[in-house]
């Protein structure tokens, strides 16, 4: 569910939301580190209906959710890291 994602596209997000998204609507969370043409970290939530939401990395709910996911994955498998670059 949690994915560190490297992309050739510049910043994906223009506006970021702090609005809570319930876990049941979330398919995957992509974390785009700074760099690769974008000066800021971006967090992209893919919803199950294929829409995406750019979430403010400072939003408390997303920080809590990522912490829970990290703990859950560290107790089983490491967080998957996909250095996938879409051509």
């Amino acid at each position: 569910v949690l994915e560190v994602y490297y992309t050739s596209l510049r910043c994906r997000c223009v506006q970021e939301s702090s609005v809570f998204i319930p876990r049941r609507f979330i398919d995957r969370i992509q974390i785009l580190p700074r760099g690769n043409g974008c000066p800021r970290k971006e967090i992209i939530v893919w919803k199950k209906n294929k829409s995406i939401v750019c979430v403010d990395p400072q939003a408390e709910w997303i920080q809590r959710m990522m912490e829970v996911l990290r703990k859950r994955s560290s107790s089983t498998l490491p967080v998957p890291v996909f250095k996938r670059k879409i051509p």
């Epitope: 596209l9 997000c13 506006q15 893919w46 919803k47 294929k50 829409s51 995406i52 879409i86």
Partner: antibody
Amino acid sequence: QVQLQESGPGLVKPSETLSLTCTVSGFSLSTFGMGVGWIRQPPGKGLEWIAHIWWDDDRRYNPALKSRVTISKDTSKNQFSLKLSSVTAADTAVYYCARIAGYYGSRDWFAYWGQGTTVTVSS
Amino acid sequence: DIQMTQSPSSLSASVGDRVTITCRASESVDNSGISFMHWYQQKPGKAPKLLIFRASDLESGVPSGFSGSGSRTDFTLTISSLQPEDFATYYCQQSNKDPWTFGQGTKLEIK
């Protein structure tokens, strides 16, 4: 590199079902965020989106064609297919398969295209 | 459905000319600050080729003479100095709402 290749019969009789296949290389149909689809272009006219299918088998159809269209994929063969039933002369067109860029989900765009295959509907 | 209207439908121009093609959507194609409007070039007998995505982002490998601008419902594709290989048909496409829809095309011909 990314490649898409359409195949199928060039001639289909009215009222029959048109079946096309697109074979892809350079990417996997099962990769998260991946979508592929079909677009057609009648002779001398513009482009019309038909349908696309996502990595998780979620399918989206053009409402104008939905009752006659089925899109499917076979990940193991790196292929996806289009079936259009009850065809008429109005379905004569060049049919393109294409790959969605993979950045914005339902709000994405077509980044890569096959070269197209001409389908004529005639008896 | 969102209707896309391109103008002009056809255009005659000379090598070196600056050319602007417009595309108007029947409703806004913006979402979260991004315009989901894209431009393609198609040459006779060939598949369309992506030129511009998100209204103004140049696709990799596309010459810098192409540029896109606009927001909400009104968009333009500009070719700063026409080259012989630029004579083709150009299509806009919106992806903000299903079904994804294309403009009817603008045919750019040699004067």
